[in-house]
């Protein structure tokens, strides 16, 4: 799998999409996990509804939400109020039994807010009570890592 880079601005929302073959993954729940090191486990962040027929319902864990268009074949993850600590490597997964297939490897990059020199009064920050539906989603910038680019820096 190539790694796709998604860039978002600190404090805003980032939408990550993972396309897949809807027939191949028919009936399978999906998950979003964070890669812990190059050879480490992928730690589950959030998964789709436990009834596959309700996969389109948005599920949430903290500031991360997931929804699955099972007919169209697109898994969508929304990272709300993006913070520097959200940067890192992730995977979109298709679950079957205790196994998981990787749909897409993702690198999330968090860019500094270009407005951060302004007064806080000029900044719009989503309130705790606001739903994901209400949160402003920036168009994410994505690219695939070029061949030869190292997704994990070599450890010393």
């Amino acid at each position: 799998h190539n790694t796709t880079v998604f860039q978002g601005v600190e404090g805003q929302s980032l939408q990550v999409s993972c396309p897949y073959d809807s027939m191949k993954h028919w009936g399978r729940r999906k998950a979003w996990c964070r890669q812990l090191g190059e050879k480490g486990p992928c730690q589950r962040v959030v998964s789709t509804h436990n009834l596959w027929l309700l996969s389109f319902l948005r599920r949430r864990n903290g500031s991360t939400a997931i929804t699955d268009d099972t007919l169209g074949g697109t898994l969508t993850i929304t990272l709300r109020n993006l913070q520097p600590h959200d940067a890192g490597f992730y995977q979109c997964q298709s679950l079957h039994g205790s196994e998981a297939d990787t749909l897409r490897k993702v690198l999330v990059e968090v860019l500094a807010d270009p407005l951060d020199h302004r007064d806080a009064g000029d900044l719009w920050v989503p309130g705790e009570s606001e739903s994901f539906e209400d949160a402003h989603v920036e168009h994410s910038i994505s690219r695939s890592l070029l061949e030869g680019e190292i997704p994990f820096p070599p450890t010393s």
Epitope: H49, N50, L51, W52, L53, L57, L71, S131
Partner: antibody, heavy 126, light 106 residues
């Protein structure tokens, strides 16, 4: 008029089988997910399972207590949903209802059930 | 599974009274909650979906509110035809119902 009519209930011995039918009329049956619920005498409501709309090709989901024993299917040409109940237990005694899930748009629906049948009684006893 | 605790289990009120029923989820279910009315010997009827949306054709005296774990169902002015048992139903994880609240007229 939008309507659901259940049939097939009755008295059956433990371990035996029974098939319930839910005949739909007044709406495009294939566009909707269909669900089965039950209610034991004097008790509350319990979800049994559901089957997706035509777009989902007969995909089903079940509550844990009936998984492997009950099967939901649908016949689009007859606008009928079925509940096949095998290996029946005394605790399966209840009024069984079929219901229609609310529809959003093509293929997508809502697990709120806006049309219900009148129910059919199933008694499992020796 | 998520447990739905409905209270009170029964209540008696006068015609015209404001009636409130609560439903508490054992964990956060956002707004994934519906309310149904069931009259004796009849099938349930959908009244409210997504915690606060009134189903088409349902009188406006019925309303719902809440999110997270705590939800409220209200009949602003009780009518004789409202005598029934009311159930909440969550769909955040599988589908489960509350135990029901039986509403009677004083």
């Amino acid at each position: 008029e939008v309507q659901l009519v259940e049939s097939g209930g009755g008295l059956v011995q433990p371990g035996r089988s029974l098939r319930l039918s839910c005949t739909a009329s007044g709406f495009t049956f294939g566009d909707y997910a269909m669900s089965w619920f039950r209610q034991a005498p004097g008790k509350g409501l319990e979800w049994v399972g559901f089957i997706g709309s035509k777009a989902y090709g007969g995909t089903t989901e079940y509550t844990a207590s009936v998984k492997g024993r009950f099967t939901i299917s649908r016949d689009g040409s007859k606008s009928i949903a079925y509940l096949q109940m095998n290996s029946l237990k005394t605790e399966d005694t209840a009024v069984y209802y079929c219901a229609r899930g609310k529809r959003y748009s093509y293929g997508y629906w809502h697990p709120a059930f806006d049309v219900w049948g009148q129910g059919t009684m199933v008694t499992v006893s020796s | 599974d998520i447990q739905m605790t409905q209270s009170p289990s029964s209540l008696s009120a006068s015609v015209g009274d404001r009636v409130t029923i609560t439903c508490q989820a054992s964990q956060d279910i956002t707004n994934y909650l519906n309310w149904y009315q069931q009259k004796p010997g009849k099938a349930p009827k959908l009244l409210i979906y997504d915690a606060s949306n009134l189903e088409t054709g349902v009188p406006s005296r019925f309303s719902g509110s809440g999110s997270g774990t705590d939800f409220t169902f209200t009949i602003s002015s009780l009518q004789p035809e409202d005598i029934a048992t009311y159930y909440c139903q969550q769909y955040d994880s599988y589908l489960t119902f509350g135990g029901g609240t039986k509403v009677e007229i004083k």
